[in-house]
Amino acid sequence: QASLSCDAAGVCDGSSRSFTSIPSGLTANTKKLDLSFNKITYIGHGDLRACVNLRVLTLESSGINTIEGDAFYSLGSLEHLDLSNNHLSSLSSSWFRPLSSLKYLNLMGNPYRTLGETSLFSNLTNLQTLRVGNVDTFSEIRRIDFAGLTSLNELEIQVLSLGNYESRSLQSIRDIYHLTLHLSESAFLLGIFADILSSVRYLELRDTNLARFQFSELSVDEINSPMKKLAFRNADLTDKSFNELLKLLRYILELMEVEFDHCTLNGVGNFNPSESDVVRELGKVETVTIRSLHIPQFYLFYDLSTVYSLLEKVKRITVENSKVFLVPCSFSQHLKSLEFLDLSENLMVEEYLKNSACEGGWPSLQSLVLSQNHLRSIRKTAEILLTLKNLTALDISKNSFQPMPDSCQWPGKMRFLNLSSTGIQAVKTCIPQTLEVLDVSNNNLDSFSLFLPRLQELYISRNKLKTLPEASLFPVLQVMKIRENAISTFSKDQLGSFPKLETLEAGDNHFICSCELLSFILERPALVHVLVDWPDSYLCDSPPRLHGQRLQDARPSVLECHQ
């Protein structure tokens, strides 16, 4: 018989124990109970009666198909209830009536068609997070469903088979910070959108085929929508439906952020927003994020000239993992307010980057991320970016660079440079002297002897250094992370000569636990405040007798130290 393991704090773990019923022996001491991934099927009225102080009850994927009406009557202190992915084909309001303290409720992945015959949640006045719906059977949203709920932090509704949406069903919730809607078709989208305009701050639309979406004027009063963020995840769009979606932005004038994640655009970027709306529609949008956009015809993609004016005020753009190999010069020149650009995981090479970072392109750009592209020459990359007069931060990590030359020309204001995971074997004077932060972690460096007068932070973990770099190279260094190298020791001279060092992370090196090193550590209790990963990451590699022991605990023999 499987048993429940509980600790002194009343946390009981019964996950994946093949329980076929709620285990006995639960007491008022039980604060947290996890019975997920079992075969419980039934919860009777007395099964949880002793758990009067229970705060968290997790019953995810427990095979439950029946819950007695008063099964939760003693759970007045319950704050978190997860009933997701069970076999509950109907829901009862009597389950939830006693749960006046409930803040989190997850009912997703159960085979109900509706949310019951009466308002399930009207007693849950403290509810902050609610997740409902399923992939296939849940098909109707009615006005009674969310009655009584006035304010939620998160509401997630999975309704991929929506057949009917009763107007104003979601309007009763006056304030929703984050609404996630899994909708397979766009048929009811306009109706839902009208109902949530005055309540939702962050709308996330998932798994939706928007190819046939058509805008029509909303019959709403003059609304000052609080919506600040709009996200589309795993959605299908066309050039035409994108134009139609843009029209929704007329109603959310405070919108600041738009995100497209794992979407498919069956088009070539031939967008044609109606001229009158162009300036208005993205009025306050500052951040546009596109991740893993799939464009089957990406080689035919237009230069987006039709939406240039839409993007002139945008400050932050991310286009990640979307097969970008070239940003047209004219497009770059129109991104007049752009301060941050992330083109990670794309196909950029220096020669095409030159076209993008053309004269007058990205005039306000301060941070550029080109991590994991096809860049091959640090010198060429630096030179091409000279046009970016305001560039202070550059991330070119995870590119496979040829050996670094001795000299390179960089934008004059460069303060941050990330060259991690680039396969570099030596650091040369090509690195700009203006840097305040340098990341060269996860490379093949066996030494570092470059003078960087303004450097405040050096990240050099996962390399092959045998000693700490000379302190005189970095007169103002505050942070050094040098984990997972081949450092065998450090001394008073080495550490004492970093006058401003506040943080040193040097764990997981191959320390030789000599008398000198161990006595130095004993003499310097203040080291603990500098070594952030002390003491667990600082282990003796040798001598064999001390192998694996923490430096803090290692004690050399008297003989060894007085030879």
């Epitope: 070239l326 047209p328 010069c329 196909l347 020669e351 095409y352 995870k398």
Partner: antibody, heavy 118, light 111 residues
Framework: QVQLVQSGSELKKPGASVKLSCKAS????????INWVRQAPGQGLEWIGW????????NFNENFKDRATITVDTSASTAYMELSSLRSEDTAVYFC???????????WGQGTTVTVSS | DIVLTQSPATLSLSPGERATLSCRAS??????????MQWYQQKPGQPPKLLIF???NVESGVPDRFSGSGSGTDFTLKISRVEAEDVGMYFC?????????FGGGTKVEIK
């Protein structure tokens, strides 16, 4: 250093299928596209299609769309190209090549000779 | 499909002479300021080797006697002083539109 090593020569009968492999090393396999190109004896080069290992997306020359399948095993850094319903005019050297910058083929495998004959 | 026509079919030169190979596309291969045209060299029994990409960018490790030029539909590969090791077939290739296509090739031989 970057290398693409292809499987050995194949002799096939008309109507059969052939599956060629291309093992990559010296670079992050999922960061680049892998293309397949063939060259019939004494002829020019003909592009078959590509795959992006990161997301598995493929694109084919219409001439091969119904007969060619390109797949990858990212754990083994290997790309595969299967050609079905072989005919004598499929006799050629088949090359895999790394796609850089989305537009050019900067490293090529040594080629696999496929002979289709009854 | 974009058809690439290379000329001449064969180019026979003495060492040190200048070679000019031409590639004409049936439609423009421009993509917003960049010509998506490549040149490859292939020696007998070997795979092709990239020489030039984006019409004029010389691939790393390629001798500087090779240069590429052109835009729109007309492209040229020049070898400033031909050497014995330059013999082989030269192919142009466009990546502006799918399917990607190659020219029929120009054979360079030394007299």
């Amino acid at each position: 250093q970057v290398q693409l090593v292809q499987s050995g020569s194949e002799l096939k009968k008309p109507g059969a299928s052939v599956k060629l492999s291309c093992k990559a090393s010296g670079f992050t396999f999922t960061t680049y596209g892998i293309n397949w190109v063939r060259q019939a004896p004494g002829q020019g080069l003909e592009w078959i299609g590509w795959i992006y290992p990161r997301d598995g997306s493929t694109n084919f020359n219409e001439n091969f769309k119904d007969r060619a399948t390109i797949t990858v095993d990212t754990s083994a850094s290997t790309a595969y190209m299967e050609l079905s319903s072989l005919r004598s005019e499929d006799t050629a050297v088949y090359f895999c090549a790394r796609l850089t910058g989305g537009t050019f083929l900067d490293y090529w495998g040594q080629g696999t000779t496929v002979t289709v004959s009854s | 499909d974009i058809v690439l026509t290379q000329s001449p079919a064969t180019l026979s030169l003495s060492p040190g002479e200048r070679a000019t190979l031409s590639c004409r596309a049936s439609e423009s291969v421009e993509y917003y300021g960049t010509s998506l045209m490549q040149w490859y060299q292939q020696k007998p029994g070997q795979p092709p080797k990239l020489l030039i990409f984006g019409a004029s960018n010389v691939e790393s490790g390629v001798p500087d006697r090779f240069s590429g030029s052109g835009s729109g539909t007309d492209f040229t590969l020049k070898i400033s002083r031909v050497e014995a090791e330059d013999v082989g077939m030269y192919f142009c290739q466009q990546s502006r539109k799918l399917p990607w296509t190659f020219g029929g090739g120009t054979k360079v031989e030394i007299k």
